[in-house]
């Protein structure tokens, strides 16, 4: 699909000179200027003509007010000044502050726990299928198939450490070579970035907040995808990761060491273990080709058991299977031998909710998935609200300055690298890149952290998770030490290579530009965020996997034309931006294609229609929920009353392209202005068209 012209003004810095523009570009959009204005080659710039951009893919919508949506919002302090408060007011303020801080920690704790439960839920729903992906060894020798298996498995189990441990076991037992494991590790790296993207979806209520949150989350996705796009072919051609890690292993004689301290797990486990406990070995057994494991439940029932080793007479297929003739005999029909049989005797049951329910894994998975997403969403809303009310005025200024300001002049370039170290350190502490990046997402959304600062923090998080894996590998038993260490090092050097590709030179920081572009599209068409998530993390990997099953010729036959088409679109896009004069008039824009091929507008109309029908049915339910939320949150500008208007009334009302304000539960007190007069509140009642963008969520 060609890029969308309605979103083409990708201007990171409107004040800079750009080739093809007559002068410094004003932030005032073209439609507000005179239509007769000409560019450098004398051609009149029509009202609809769009200005060029730095990036071929960054697609940014126009902003009538002339404000840059990526500017961090001013978190104004609307409360009474400290000096103006009396003693009682000051005491109350302190108590409120402490209370808010405790609540914030509480919601943050629940947020992290719900992420853990979400991972368990995904494993219950798709863990066995994920394990089966691994059991097809012939496919995994194909690097592209390996990559998508890594993506799919990690998305399904919501844990790169689970997929990594399966890979380690398979390498250790020679079911997989390190060479074949590298693309899977790369895929696992991509798969792990879905978590914070899901978290970002929860902030879809406020357009600008969502724009920032979604961009902040997808900067991780783009970094991983772009790294793979460059490094997978490089690895397939040169095997540099395999060679480099072999070299490291041979140079340094690694000894078994201590595992990384599980600081976060120590706090969250007591709670999450009361909800669900899983037997991760089942997925591993399926991956290793154990057919019996297919019928086992992932839900852990027994937590305490003792192991008895007893000598037992067991039958063997033939005398060749005997350890020695001394330990072999026959009863005339079968051959018998003595074997040490390990029998597990269960002593105590686990203490989680589902221990006594004989529900299938899928049912428990769906229940937990629903509950964890609701809790995750609720916690996120509350965190955003609390942060919004805490981060005001001076506090906000200090925090924003601390987080987003660079070092003084000669050392400005070091700031990003420090952020990488901070990201790595924080991830090492919490032992999960998903937790760290997911916790960062709402902060990006409300404007505490800029995308430019979130990017190195995310890269650091990628490094942090690999250092954790290296320590875990060092703590693994002797037989798996080498393979687990080599895989952990491959993961580490892959991320280092990615950082070297997409960070040091500001020009190469493509993930930021791409994420901002996607943020803009998703802010305008919120359904696109869901489409992106499904398309990039499920549809594309599943399609590639399906084609891999059909064999190399089919994969190449289908893949190459698609890649060539994408490259053609990309080249054409670049030419349209950089030097449109060399192109024929027809190719200077995408108007030669049908509208649905180069614009999201027709698609939006279709989705609006679908969601309108859906909205009619669940409208009254929405209104009740909205009112309850308003009561709980104490929102001043709740708009539930006109939720269920007649279609006629809706059409009569003029369409206003006001940025969609969050309804009810999504209302962010920190970000929205106080509603002084009711009239203003009434104007903000959304038309069905505008509202349709939120209904996806």
């Amino acid at each position: 699909m060609a890029p969308w012209p309605e979103l083409e003004n990708a201007q990171p810095n409107p004040g800079k000179f750009i080739e093809g523009a007559s002068g410094p570009q004003s932030s005032i959009p073209a439609k507000d200027k005179e239509a007769s204005k000409t560019n450098d080659n004398g051609t009149p710039v029509a009202k609809t003509e769009l200005l060029p951009s730095y990036s071929a893919l960054v697609l940014i919508e126009e902003h009538p007010e002339g404000t840059d949506p990526w500017d961090l919002p001013e978190l104004q302090d609307t409360g009474i000044k400290w000096s103006e408060r009396d003693t009682k007011g000051k005491t109350l303020c302190i108590f409120q502050g402490v209370g808010k801080f405790i609540l914030l920690l509480g919601f943050l704790y629940l947020f992290v726990c719900s992420l853990d439960v979400l991972s368990s839920a995904f494993q219950l729903v798709g863990g066995k299928v994920a394990g089966q992906f691994f059991s097809n060894n012939s496919i995994m020798s194909n690097p592209v198939a390996g990559l998508v298996i890594g993506v799919l498995v990690t998305v399904m189990v919501q844990s790169s450490s689970t997929s990594s441990s399966i890979i380690v076991s398979m390498v250790a037992s020679s079911l997989l070579t390190v060479r074949a494991a590298i693309p899977i590790i790369m895929g696992a790296n991509i798969g792990t970035s879905i978590t914070n993207t899901i978290v970002a979806l929860m902030q879809a209520g406020d357009r600008n907040e969502f724009r920032r949150a979604f961009a902040g989350a997808t900067v991780h996705d783009f970094f991983n995808w772009l790294s793979v796009f460059v490094l997978l072919p490089l690895e397939a051609a040169t095997h540099y990761l395999e060679i480099l890690t072999n070299l490291v292993l041979e140079t340094f004689k690694f000894q078994n060491g201590e595992d990384a301290p599980d600081i976060l797990k120590v706090i969250t486990d007591p709670f999450t273990k009361l909800i669900i406990q899983l037997d991760k070995k089942v997925i591993q057994q399926i991956a290793m080709g154990d057919s019996a494991a297919q019928n086992k439940s992932l839900i852990k029932i027994w937590c305490k058991s003792i192991t008895n080793v007893t000598e037992m007479n067991v039958t063997v297929p033939s005398t060749d299977n005997c350890t020695s003739p001394s330990y072999c005999w026959t009863d005339g029909i079968q051959t018998w031998t003595i074997q040490n049989v390990t029998q597990k005797e269960n002593i105590a049951k686990c203490q989680h909710i589902f221990v006594n329910f004989s529900l299938p894994d899928l049912a428990v998975g769906i229940i937990l998935l629903t509950v964890s997403l609701v809790v995750l969403c609720g916690c996120l809303i509350m965190i955003v609200k609390l942060l919004g009310s805490v981060l005001r005025g001076q506090v906000a200024t200090v925090i924003k300055k601390t987080l987003n300001t660079d070092f003084p002049f000669p050392f400005a370039w070091l700031t990003g690298y420090l952020a990488i170290l901070v990201g790595a350190g924080m991830t090492f502490i919490v032992q999960s890149s998903s937790v760290f990046t997911s916790a960062m997402t709402p902060l990006i959304g409300i404007g505490v952290i800029s995308i430019e600062r979130a990017y190195p923090l995310t890269l650091g998080s990628n490094i942090g998770t690999t250092t954790t894996a290296i320590l875990a590998a060092l703590a693994s038993p002797g037989n798996t030490l080498r393979s687990s260490l080599q895989i952990a090092l491959c993961h580490f050097f892959f991320n280092i290579s990615g950082i070297l590709l997409w960070y040091p030179i500001p020009f190469t920081r493509l993930p930021i530009r791409l994420a901002k572009g996607l943020g803009n599209i998703s802010a305008k068409y919120r359904w696109f965020a869901v489409f992106y998530l499904i398309f990039f993390f499920f549809v594309t990997p599943l399609t590639v996997f399906g084609l891999s099953l059909a064999g190399w010729p089919v994969l190449v036959g289908v893949g190459v034309p698609i890649i060539l088409l994408l490259l053609l679109v990309l080249c054409l896009r670049m030419l349209q931006f950089r030097c449109p004069r060399i192109l024929p008039l027809k190719l200077r824009d995408w108007n030669f294609l049908p509208l649905w091929m180069h614009s999201l507008k027709p698609w939006d109309n279709v989705i609006s229609l679908a969601t309108t029908c859906f909205q009619r049915r669940c409208c009254c339910c929405c209104r009740v929920c909205c009112r309850v939320c308003c009561m709980v949150c104490g929102c001043k500008c709740c708009r539930c009353s006109k939720c269920c208007r007649d279609q006629g009334e809706e059409e009569e009302e003029k369409e206003q392209d006001i940025p969609v304000k969050a309804s009810g539960a999504f209302d962010n007190a920190a970000m929205s202005k106080e509603c002084q007069d009711e009239g203003k509140g009434q104007v903000e009642v959304l038309s069905m068209k505008a509202l349709s963008n939120t209904t996806v969520f």
Epitope: N313, T319, S324, P325, S326, Y327, C328, W329, T330, D331, G332, I333, Q334, T335, W336
Partner: antibody, heavy 120, light 107 residues
Framework: QVQLVQSGAEVVKPGASVKMSCKTS????????MHWVRQAPGQGLEWIGA????????SYNQKFKGRVTLTADKSTSTAYMELSSLRSEDTAVYYC?????????????WGQGTLVTVSS | DIQMTQSPSSLSASVGDRVTITCKAS??????VAWYQQKPGKVPKLLIY???TRHTGVPSRFSGSGSGTDFTLTISSLQPEDVATYYC?????????FGGGTKVEIK
Amino acid sequence: QVQLVQSGAEVVKPGASVKMSCKTSGYTFITYNMHWVRQAPGQGLEWIGAIYPGSGDTSYNQKFKGRVTLTADKSTSTAYMELSSLRSEDTAVYYCSISTIITTGAVDYWGQGTLVTVSS
Amino acid sequence: DIQMTQSPSSLSASVGDRVTITCKASQDVGTAVAWYQQKPGKVPKLLIYWTSTRHTGVPSRFSGSGSGTDFTLTISSLQPEDVATYYCQQYSRIPLTFGGGTKVEIK
């Protein structure tokens, strides 16, 4: 008590076949392996083969393979041995026996024996 | 097939004597060896299995020993009723094989 009652003596011509039976009682027929052992006059013991009545699994001494067939009828708790292409050296007492010592080939209950005489 | 070679083929001893019968296997059979007693005109009777385990009802004067390839049946004090032919048997491999037998007589 465990009892194994074998069919009566047989006189057969060389090249012919003989089918003898072993009716059991006093135990669960399908539980133990049934062995067949022969003893030529004034000679030692020779193992022919065994059958597990529960599944019908059989095992034969290569020396008799192709000539001997062991079967078991669970309904009557009777085991059968058929020996074909008889030769004069097949003249012997044929015993059916069971091993109640699970997993071993040591037989502890024997039938009274069936004398087969191969003579023209 | 595993050959079981018994020696002597016959022996004569006085009542109360200690009698030893040996059995040699052509290859390692572990301890999967049984001993049988067959009195003239009777069916064989199991005496010992697993080289040294006495079967139910077998007098304590009968004992077995050995492992691998060399095995021994010992009658600590020969009694008149012990007159019989004694057979060793291996059940380590199929086919099960018996020794040639040792005929024990009273002097």
